[in-house]
């Protein structure tokens, strides 16, 4: 799937109005300097690809974020404003239903959400030059 045809301004508005707040809530109690993230993405479609990767897929030390509030709102925003996105999600949604595990917020998940915050911030500033 290619995020090129998404309505980026609508997705940005959804992020600013609600997703960003849910990410902050998830990170509550953590210092902003605790995780030294150098994550980046080169353009808006690439940023959304990275956001998709880290929001809906396990990574080392963090098994799942997909049921968090920010993840559900991210999925809704992508489904509404990225044509054809919903069709890519069928298997993943069915697989999620099979695995109902107790929610545990690990330090690794906090680090991953901190990475997500960096990607979203980059998504919102597409005209900035890469560091």
């Amino acid at each position: 799937y290619d995020f090129t045809n998404c309505d980026f301004e609508k997705i940005k508005a959804a992020y600013l109005s609600t997703i960003s707040k849910d990410l902050i809530t998830y990170m509550s109690g953590t210092k902003s300097t605790e995780f030294n993230n150098t994550v980046s993405c080169s353009n808006r479609p690439h940023c959304l690809t990275e956001i998709q990767s880290l929001t809906f897929n396990p990574t080392a030390g963090c098994a799942s974020l997909a049921k968090e509030m920010f993840a559900m709102k991210t999925k809704a925003a992508l489904a509404i404003w990225c044509p054809g996105y919903s069709e890519t999600q069928i298997n993943a949604t069915q697989a999620m239903k099979k695995r109902r595990k107790r929610k545990v917020t690990t330090n690794k998940c906090l680090e991953q959400v901190s990475q997500l915050q960096g990607l979203w911030r980059r998504f919102n500033r597409p005209l900035l030059k890469q560091q």
């Epitope: 690439h46 880290l54 897929n57």
Partner: nanobody, 117 residues
Framework: EVQLVESGGGLVQPGGSLRLSCAAS????????LYWYRQAAGIERELIAS???????NYVDSVKGRFTISRDNSENTMYLQMNSLRAEDTGVYYC???????????WGQGTLVTVSS
Amino acid sequence: EVQLVESGGGLVQPGGSLRLSCAASGSGFGVNILYWYRQAAGIERELIASITSGGITNYVDSVKGRFTISRDNSENTMYLQMNSLRAEDTGVYYCASRNIFDGTTEWGQGTLVTVSS
């Protein structure tokens, strides 16, 4: 569908280094999230390192600072540089490639790493 083949395993002394490779053929490798798993004797397979298409990496604490995951999308290859190896790093190392949209995961056949003096 992506087919994966690991290489680079072997016997190494404690404190030594190894570099594992995972070569992919087929389509979809470029945007997939890639993983290295380790399975030690009698222990469940453990996800130890992951890397997104853009190079964002995550590690479990037991390997952080010693292992480095990387990928070369132009060569369809992923690597795991393992330094300061310990006896507890012994196991079969598997690479995996996961479709970031539908969760479909392809696995390599594994390569054995033995850390022993």
